[in-house]
């Protein structure tokens, strides 16, 4: 595949990653699966340069990000690590709450209204991030 | 402006069934969870149901659960209430409501008129 | 289930007066998203309910600023600055922190 060097229309550059921001809800499978479809994942977050960036753009909305425990450890969907990587959970976060009457606990991360990131029910549709790396190889044929 | 039109509602005998339809316009009908709520004459709010905006999930009250099926037609922006194995409690107006926004929000900013629905032999 | 508890059940007041309303919840309404799912409803005779405040203290588009949401975890209360004629309904407190989502009783206010 081609190298991609600029970002897709309707999507934004930062520190050689693009981002785009949906503007209405899925659950976080659908999300994911929304991100995959565009050769990319959802967001994974990685510094508190890269959170602040994310949440200038999202605004005080829950979002989804790559992250989720759904077989057990907390895993980010690109394969970085979570026990040495960034982290920005609220207070007495993540906390798998069972008491939401969704049945099961709590098993993806999204972004709160103050950035800070909560554990919650997978199936609740809540805007998501989608990302790519700029300078890895696309899925795209090279144009001939 | 967003408009949710309940039909379908009307007198039924206990032990029969019934189907409400809810018609939407003037906003985008598939992006959107909807809920049923009902009261009973002379009585509070009851919340009864939930679907996602795409029909994936759908949640009930427990006084209805097994008897209740809501479900939607994304293509003909209309959301439904089958409700079978009537009885005399389940006489009430029922409303149809819309999330407010179209992702998760957790309250209803729109609702239609009501369909009365009455439940006697 | 959430049990949702208003009081007073109903009230009567004086046109410029102002008026109070307690909701209380059997568990606390904070989500660990920080918001609190507590919601405030008026039902006008005759008319389906239309929500007054989102959030504990959010007031909805077009709701006049006399009207105010307070509270947090389990305690909260509607105020009206100065009520007016067309405040008379019922007044229901909602939660949504918990399926199934319930209601408080209503609260009757009245013009004397």
């Known amino acids: 595949g081609s190298e991609r060097t600029c970002c897709p229309v309707n999507w934004v550059e930062h520190e050689r990653s693009c981002y785009w921001f949906s503007r209405s809800g899925k659950a976080w499978a659908d999300a994911d699966n929304y991100c995959r479809l565009e050769d990319a994942h959802l967001v994974v977050v990685t510094s508190w340069e890269e959170q602040k960036f994310v949440q200038h753009h999202i605004g005080p909305v829950n979002t989804w990000m790559g992250l989720h425990d759904q077989n057990g450890p907390w895993k980010w969907v690109d394969g970085t690590d979570y026990e040495t990587g960034f982290k920005n959970w609220r207070p007495e976060q993540p906390d798998d709450w069972y008491g939401h009457g969704l049945g099961g606990g709590e098993d993806c991360a999204h972004f709160t209204d103050d950035g800070r990131w909560n554990d919650d029910v997978c199936q609740r549709p809540y805007r998501w991030v989608c990302e790519t790396e700029l300078d890895k190889a696309s899925q795209e044929p090279p144009l001939l | 402006q967003v408009q949710l039109v309940e039909s379908g509602g009307g007198v039924v005998q206990p032990g029969r069934s019934l189907r409400l339809s809810c018609a939407a316009s003037g906003f985008t009908f598939s992006s959107y969870g909807m809920h049923w709520v009902r009261q009973a004459p002379g009585k509070g709010l009851e919340w009864v149901a939930i679907?996602?905006?795409?029909?994936?999930?759908?949640y009930y009250a427990d006084s209805v659960k097994g008897r209740f099926t809501i479900s939607r037609d994304n293509s003909k922006n209309t959301l439904y209430l089958q409700m079978s194995s009537l009885r005399a409690e389940d006489t009430a107006v029922y409303y149809c409501?819309?999330?407010?926004?179209?992702?998760?929000?957790?309250?209803?900013?729109?609702w239609g008129q009501g369909a009365l629905v009455t439940v006697s032999s | 289930d959430i049990v949702m508890t208003q009081t007073p059940l109903s009230l009567s007041v004086t046109p410029g007066q102002p008026a109070s309303i307690s909701c209380k919840s059997s568990?606390?309404?904070?989500?660990?998203?920080?918001?609190?799912?507590l919601y405030w409803y008026l039902q006008k005779p005759g008319q389906p309910p239309q929500l007054l405040i989102y959030e504990v203290s959010n007031r909805f588009s077009g709701v006049p600023d006399r009207f105010s949401g307070s509270g947090s975890g389990t305690d909260f209360t509607l105020k009206i600055s100065r009520v007016e004629a067309e405040d008379v309904g019922i007044y229901y407190c909602?939660?949504?922190?918990?399926?199934?989502?319930?209601f408080g009783q209503g609260t009757r206010v009245e013009i004397k």
């Open positions: 909602m939660q949504s922190i918990q399926i199934p989502w319930t």
């Open positions: 409501a819309r999330d407010a926004h179209d992702f998760w929000s957790g309250y209803f900013a729109y």
């Open positions: 568990q606390s309404l904070l989500h660990g998203d920080g918001k609190t799912y």
């Open positions: 679907i996602w905006y795409d029909g994936s999930y759908k």
